[in-house]
Interface confidence: low
Amino acid sequence: QQQTLPKPFIWAEPHFMVPKEKQVTICCQGNYGAVEYQLHFEGSLFAVDRPKPPERINKVQFYIPDMNSRMAGQYSCIYRVGELWSEPSNLLDLVVTEMYDTPTLSVHPGPEVISGEKVTFYCRLDTATSMFLLLKEGRSSHVQRGYGKVQAEFPLGPVTTAHRGTYRCFGSYNNHAWSFPSEPVKLLVTGDIENTSLAPEDPTFPADTWGTYLLTTETGLQKDHALWDHTAQNLLR
């Protein structure tokens, strides 16, 4: 006899990185017929939703209208059908950004390189942080961690045309509180003639995500956001 239901899927819209004072919705998708969903934050019950009618709804949304450092952390959700509870979802790391200060991002030897050259990004922030994060626009799994008192370096090694794109960095005050994003640095990698076509970078994460992240407005959320990739989440842990 089945003792638990399959775990629900949890994600954040429009993004798991939320500028402070902006809105985010935590979505939990379970099964049709679920009469109750619970959202847990840092291990404690945070919110409850009871969909009506349960047989026609398999997803609930928990709305956070104004993100701040106290709302940042690890979320999970569970649901109930009758008296039977599900396994807990994977952990969602909700990150608050735009805290305190703005780092600077530079690239060596420069933003235009030839395929095969060794490239290193440098992220610098003079305030009290020792962890830095480098993100490549267009793909959530491209998150790298670096450490340093004032500056972290991110060696990409010999680059290929797959490395080209727009990069930003953050200083991290803790796992769930990040600085403002740096100004973007566009890396242009030229390679063999047959490799220079600009193919889409990654269909799993929309190219306009950064625009959404930076311009989350008070008028509403981007509803049709692709589900973010767990790799970025795992890098936070």
């Epitope: 402070k20 004072e21 939703d49 609930v60 709305y63 209208p65």
Partner: antibody, heavy 120, light 107 residues
Amino acid sequence: QVQLQQSGPELVKPGASVKMSCKASGYTFTDYVINWGKQRSGQGLEWIGEIYPGSGTNYYNEKFKAKATLTADKSSNIAYMQLSSLTSEDSAVYFCARRGRYGLYAMDYWGQGTSVTVSS
Amino acid sequence: DIQMTQTTSSLSASLGDRVTISCRASQDISNYLNWYQQKPDGTVKLLIYYTSRLHSGVPSRFSGSGSGTDYSLTINNLEQEDIATYFCQQGNTRPWTFGGGTKLEIK
């Protein structure tokens, strides 16, 4: 402009229930939390609870958990508070207030208040 | 629950005066302190949020300061329209709690 229009005064008998409303206009109702507070004559304010109209999720002050029920109707942009098993202690002015999106738990726009008098 | 104390329940001042209203929390509230004005007709308005940030439309003669457990609201150049009761509120920990209010009157 942002406005919260509360329902009119209520005179109710002890033991009865009352349901008051707070109609929001001038902003996207589901984007902001609605708080409810209580003010007895000549006294300070007490926070009763808050509701997220977007999801129906609410938080209550433990003191009012058995007394107040908060709901919201997204289609009409109205938040409701029902008070049950009324006693003279519940005679007060009740306010609804929108919580600003500062992440700082400040209530940036308030209704004009609904006066509730409990008397036999 | 965090207790918010406004020790002065009423104070008198003259038009043009500088008035300071204080508020004390029973524990550190990390600057999550807001000030409200309640007019005699019952209308409530947000003046200051997060200790010192002026809410939109609020005259610049209002200012806030403080940290830890002690906070204050200052009104420079008191005007007739400032006659009201002023409440502080902590937004650090649920349940959100308010001070008892300070009623400002004209001498």
